[in-house]
Interface confidence: medium
Amino acid sequence: GITNINCSGHIWVEPATIFKMGMNISIYCQAAIKNCQPRKLHFYKNGIKERFQITRINKTTARLWYKNFLEPHASMYCTAECPKHFQETLICGKDISSGYPPDIPDEVTCVIYEYSGNMTCTWNAGKLTYIDTKYVVHVKSLETEEEQQYLTSSYINISTDSLQGGKKYLVWVQAANALGMEESKQLQIHLDDIVIPSAAVISRAETINATVPKTIIYWDSQTTIEKVSCEMRYKATTNQTWNVKEFDTNFTYVQQSEFYLEPNIKYVFQVRCQETGKRYWQPWSSLFFHKTPETVPQVTSKAFQHDTWNSGLTVASISTGHLTSDNRGDIG
């Protein structure tokens, strides 16, 4: 960056090179060029010469003042006009940053995705800080009192093999950057209570032409968890509102769920599960489409899911919005 140039003088920022966004700041430039009494000192921000708010302090020093500085990053350098020099002479440069101290991390959530071998911890970091912010995740065994710390810039995957202190832990997150440090509340977890079953997947659908035609949705999960609760939501693609069917189930074989649907309409289905009575749900499965026939029976399988229509409902696997106990708002 600009900080690597050879300087013929000195540039500094008050109150600091990293400061709170919206502050008034002063950038000072002091020339130390051999055989040069600068006629003028110039300031450049991101390569563009500044014209205003420049004050000459003495023969070698000038100050540039910014009110309410709102740019997250800027490269500053200053130059001197020396007598008998055709071009301006570079004095020095500095990268400056503005941002915010971190908010208190909240909604700390730790889950173990079945078969992953990891405990994944996420949190709501709050407002954007604009500057480099690090997070230290503290994991303390309630049985051995031993504490481990993990440094990260977003979420953290902790190998379950490294959790040797029994089943009960306290987890909390410290957020720190150049402008401040905050600490979350402590989350108490029991490893057996935070397992999210292996993803449930809808494999196919068929409509049986009985007296009242019925659609059977086939779905499954590779979970080894014995008692699982699932929700299947479905709607016509033209509708806004989801209908929800709930299941207490075990996946010893492929699940078959019956629906009585309107003929000749395209429906979309999704499923998600949790260990029965536990806190965290899987994200919703990817969208599965099935068009009910006018009369003739029809089968739709995963292999023929060519639709690219996606209303943004497919959820990333670490979306904290889907990992809370109070996350029912999206199933209306």
Partner: antibody, heavy 119, light 107 residues
């Protein structure tokens, strides 16, 4: 002791509406679904629907959509069921019951409210 | 919706007897069956869930069993306080549905 206390008996005229209440004691109201059941003499129990007080989300039995509306007030730890366009068919004992989210069996039941619809 | 059928509306018993109450589901409910006891003028009380898991505080004379579509509640050494109405309920899927009930009465 965990308790669900329901409002007293109601006598209403056909066509009217009524709001039944279910107040919870001694547990975290926002962590459990509150379900409502209808029991008519000799006709067993019917599930009406649930509300999750934490978010206000509801799910209804198709049979009771348009008849029952479920709400909850977190500040008073009370769940409500509003029944509209009442007929003699709605005369029954109504129970609220708690279930752990993600299960469909009911571990704590309310005291029950007798609703009589008669002119 | 899944239908739950309790074939006996009434069952007669004596104190100390062993009695079995049956319940049949209209489709496989993979052991997701609960049993409730309701005494006259009272609200139902959960006895059993997942076909055989006894709820907290329920005496061990109450036993649930079954799989597929057929389920039973057995009361061994019937006590006078067990005379009540017993309902089965499938908790496999929504809407949860109940049987019509079996009334246990004295011979």
């Amino acid at each position: 002791d965990v308790q669900l206390q329901e409002s007293g008996a109601e006598l209403v005229k056909p066509g009217a509406s009524v709001k039944l209440s279910c107040k919870s004691f001694d547990y975290t109201f926002t962590s459990f679904d509150i379900n409502w059941m209808k029991q008519r003499p000799g006709q067993g129990l019917e599930w009406i629907g649930w509300i999750f007080p934490g978010s206000g989300t509801t799910n209804y039995n198709e049979k009771f959509k348009g008849k029952a509306t479920l709400t909850a007030d977190k500040s008073s730890s009370t769940a409500y069921m509003h029944l509209t366009s009442l007929t003699s068919e709605d005369s029954a004992v109504y129970f609220c019951a708690r279930r752990l989210t993600g299960t469909r069996y009911f571990d704590v039941w309310g005291t029950g409210t007798t609703l009589t619809v008669s002119s | 919706d899944i239908q739950m059928t309790q074939s006996h509306k009434f069952l007669s018993t004596s104190v100390g007897d062993r009695i079995t109450i049956t319940c049949k589901a209209s489709q496989d409910v993979i052991t997701a069956v609960a049993w409730y006891q309701q005494k006259s003028g009272q609200s139902p009380k959960l006895l059993i869930y997942w076909a055989s898991t006894r709820h907290t505080g329920v005496p061990d004379r109450f036993t649930g069993s079954g799989s597929g579509t057929d389920y039973t509640l057995t009361i061994s050494n019937v006590q006078a306080e067990d005379l009540a109405l017993y309902y089965c309920q499938q908790h496999y899927t929504t809407p949860p549905t109940f049987g019509a009930g079996t009334k246990l009465e004295l011979k």
